[in-house]
Interface confidence: low
């Protein structure tokens, strides 16, 4: 028997991936555990092997289909179970009725690029990845810029309250190296959370023209 508190959290990327983390105090050692996904009204079911990510937590990704296939909808419900092997049998450690569109976490934005850079401003664009067409334009973004001598945690957040896949950064310092990140979140879903931050995009502002005031 396993004692201690168990926490089982999963998110749907809105297309064909459910990512799960299971943590268990008084953790199981050297035990094989899986997440089983059983949709209530779909022909398929899926399993993934939980792999350790820390002393007492495991993670895995349920791959439901090709990355851009729409495998679930807002009225689907998926029974997710954590099953761990005990000798010759499997024991259920956790269960949840998973509502995919109430538990969304999209993939990080991709294809960040500098569209135009000047001395004091920079226009940056990006793309969303594997996001459902169901959202239409109901997405929001957060962005942050890393300035020299600061950490990401200190960077102020800029919020874009609409589906806008570009930003114009203003009041930058000339001839300075910056990094930029963006993340996305659907407006739908009680337990929906922000995507991971995108890979940082490094850029440098243009130097000020000689003899001119900056």
């Amino acid at each position: 028997a396993v004692n201690g508190t168990s926490r089982f959290t999963c998110f749907y990327n809105s297309r064909a991936n459910i990512s799960c983390v299971w943590s268990q105090d008084g953790a199981l050692q050297d035990t094989s555990c899986q997440v089983h996904a059983w949709p209530d009204r779909r022909r398929w079911n899926q399993t993934c092997e939980l792999l350790p990510v820390s002393q007492a937590s495991w993670a895995c990704n349920l791959i439901l289909g090709t990355p851009d296939s729409q495998k679930l909808t807002a009225v689907d419900i998926v029974t997710l179970r954590v099953m761990c092997r005990e000798g010759v049998r499997w024991r259920m450690m956790a269960i949840q009725d998973f509502k995919p569109f109430e538990n969304l976490r999209l993939m990080a934005p991709i294809s960040l690029q500098v569209v135009h850079v000047e001395t004091h401003r920079c226009n940056i664009s990006w793309k969303i990845s594997q996001a459902s067409h169901y959202f239409e334009r109901h997405l929001e973004f957060e962005a942050r810029t890393l300035s020299p001598g600061h950490t990401w945690e200190e960077a102020p957040l800029m919020t874009l309250k609409q589906k806008q896949e570009w930003i114009c950064l203003e009041t930058l310092t000339p001839d300075t190296q910056y990094e930029f990140q963006v993340r996305v979140k659907p407006l739908q879903g009680e337990f929906t959370t922000w995507s991971p931050w995108s890979q940082p995009l490094a850029f440098r502002t243009k130097p000020a023209a000689l003899g001119k005031d900056t």
Partner: antibody, heavy 119, light 106 residues
């Protein structure tokens, strides 16, 4: 063979409560959601709510304040409770289950149980 | 809520006739079902996911459509087809049914 059998219908006083049972056989209620649908005399079908395999529920918002769906996995039985009944709740109440295939609708129905709300 | 409007509400046709019922949704739906209900009986699933025939259902029944407009057809009406037919959406909660179409034999 999948079967659903409702029971608990009958005459209920206005303002009273109703508790119906849906005994499932041929499948486990830990693997499938069970829905409740009703039909007033001479009228159409109205979806009331569902209890999913893991025990969570979805209700028709029009009934959420007076409806509770629960289940006893050990008895493989689902329960339907509605409070503050009025004459317009008079109906045949069905439990139903979706089939196995992709989005295949209510493939299995109980025979229904008649509830009459009257003084 | 999504309103499902069936037409006609009733019809009378001869044995062997082709019968068509339409179902209009108040907004676009992804998954549509058709049920047959004979008097005093529980509904029976005929068509799932717009156009797929449920198990054991004769091939004279068919369904088609997309978005907000759907059609149910009986290619050759038989005496045992006397019943009320309902459409139903399973795209958003609450799940909703059409008001029904009563089919009678002339």
């Amino acid at each position: 063979e999948v079967q659903l059998l409702e029971s608990g219908g009958g005459l209920v006083q206005p303002g009273g409560s109703l508790r119906l049972s849906c005994a499932a056989s041929g499948f486990s209620v830990t693997s499938y959601g069970v829905h409740w649908i009703r039909q007033a005399p001479g009228k159409g079908l109205e979806w009331l709510g569902v209890i999913w395999s893991g025990g969570s529920t979805d209700y028709n918002a029009a009934f959420i304040s007076r409806l509770t769906i629960s289940k006893d996995n050990s008895k493989n039985t689902v329960y339907f409770q509605m409070n503050s009944l009025r004459a317009e709740d008079t109906a045949v109440y069905y439990c139903a289950r979706a089939g196995d295939a992709n989005y295949d609708g209510f493939a299995y129905w109980g025979q229904g149980t008649l509830v009459t709300v009257s003084s | 809520d999504i309103q499902m409007t069936q037409s006609p509400s009733s019809l009378s046709a001869s044995v062997g006739d082709r019968v068509t019922i339409t179902c209009q949704a108040s907004q676009s739906v992804s998954f549509l079902y058709w049920y047959q209900q004979r008097p005093g009986k529980a509904p029976r699933l005929l068509i799932y996911d717009t156009s797929n025939l449920a198990s054991g259902v004769p091939s004279r029944f068919s369904g088609s459509g997309s978005g907000t407009s759907y059609t149910f057809t009986i290619s050759s009406l038989q005496p045992e087809d006397i019943a009320t037919y309902y459409c139903q959406q399973w795209s958003t909660y609450p799940l909703t049914f059409g008001q029904g179409t009563k089919v009678e034999i002339k």
